[in-house]
């Protein structure tokens, strides 16, 4: 349903924001070494790339119940 789609998207966005903030906070507490700066840049760039990817999606994702089954039924026909 539309509501489930919106809920899933909202959850994913919230999760990514939280994960990014947690990673940034952790990195900011690390001494400003070159390695820490590179790592923080990677997190920022990675999150931007993910947002860029989702923005290219024009249609709504199929819901999880409508994807391939975990256990496949016996095949009725062979090629």
């Amino acid at each position: 349903s539309e509501a489930e789609d919106a809920s899933l998207l909202s959850f994913m966005q919230g999760y990514m924001k939280h994960a990014t903030k947690t990673a940034k906070d952790a990195l900011s507490s690390v001494q400003e070494s070159q390695v820490a700066q590179q790592a923080r840049g990677w997190v920022t760039d990675g999150f931007s790339s993910l947002k860029d990817y989702w923005s290219t999606v024009k249609d709504k994702f199929s819901e999880f119940w409508d994807l391939d089954p975990e256990v496949r039924p016996t095949s009725a026909v062979a090629a």
Epitope: D59, L67, R72
Partner: antibody, heavy 114, light 112 residues
């Protein structure tokens, strides 16, 4: 042996209604979401609708939204497609298939004509 | 809707030779779940469609290993090695990543 057998097709006038059925056997019907797909004469395949395994959620193609209703009776291992306000462009072979297009029925022909 | 464009529209193959069919999607078919819900189906003359390949490269049970699916993102290929007479029919690509679910227009394979 796994089987999907459609029935209920036929000739109907524009504006009329039909109810298609798909009897499933040989697998645990209640564990799988199901789909209806149609194929107009000499044309390709078109997904119409999907229904969750417990029947609680459905989704539809824009071409049939508001006119077709998909449902299921897990106690009877049967899938349904109620088709209302039929148009000539709904003339096609109608197939039921399980999630992932793994298995298909033999199809039932629907012809909408005056 | 996500468009799937198959090429060629038709091809004629001598038995024993190889055939290749391409399918291009109008956007990446990687689902938020991380998998790519892309399929190849075959409809033999006068018959129902049948699934050959699921999730890009997995052969459905009972499908001969001469059928191989490959690709990623937006570009996918079905290769049939050592074509046999019974491989004749219309091949469709399909995607289940997005709603509405869509199919390619079909590629007709004829055997010489």
């Amino acid at each position: 042996e796994l089987q999907l057998v459609e029935s209920g097709g036929g000739l109907v006038q524009p504006g009329g209604s039909l109810r298609l059925s798909c009897a499933a056997s040989g697998f645990t019907f209640s564990s799988y979401s199901m789909r209806w797909v149609r194929q107009a004469p000499g044309k390709g395949l078109e997904w119409l609708s999907s229904i969750k395994s417990d029947g609680s959620i459905t989704s539809y193609a824009d071409s049939v939204k508001g006119r077709f209703t998909m449902s299921r009776d897990n106690a009877k291992n049967t899938l349904y497609l109620q088709m209302n306000s039929l148009k000539s462009e709904d003339t096609a072979m109608y197939y039921c298939t399980n999630q992932g297009y793994i298995n298909w029925g033999q199809g039932t022909q629907v012809t909408v004509s005056s | 809707a996500t468009m799937l464009t198959q090429s060629p529209g038709s091809l004629t193959i001598v038995p024993g030779e190889s055939a290749s069919i391409s399918c291009r999607a109008s956007q990446s078919l990687i689902h938020s779940a991380g998998k790519t819900y892309f399929y190849w189906l075959l409809q033999k003359p006068g018959q129902r469609p049948q699934l050959l390949i699921y999730q890009v490269s997995n052969r459905e049970s009972g499908v001969p290993d001469r059928f191989t699916g490959s690709g990623s993102g937006t570009d996918f290929t079905l290769k049939i090695s050592g074509v046999k007479a019974e491989d004749a029919g219309v091949y469709y690509c399909a995607q289940g990543t997005y709603n509405p679910k869509t199919f390619g227009q079909g590629t007709k394979l004829e055997i010489k």
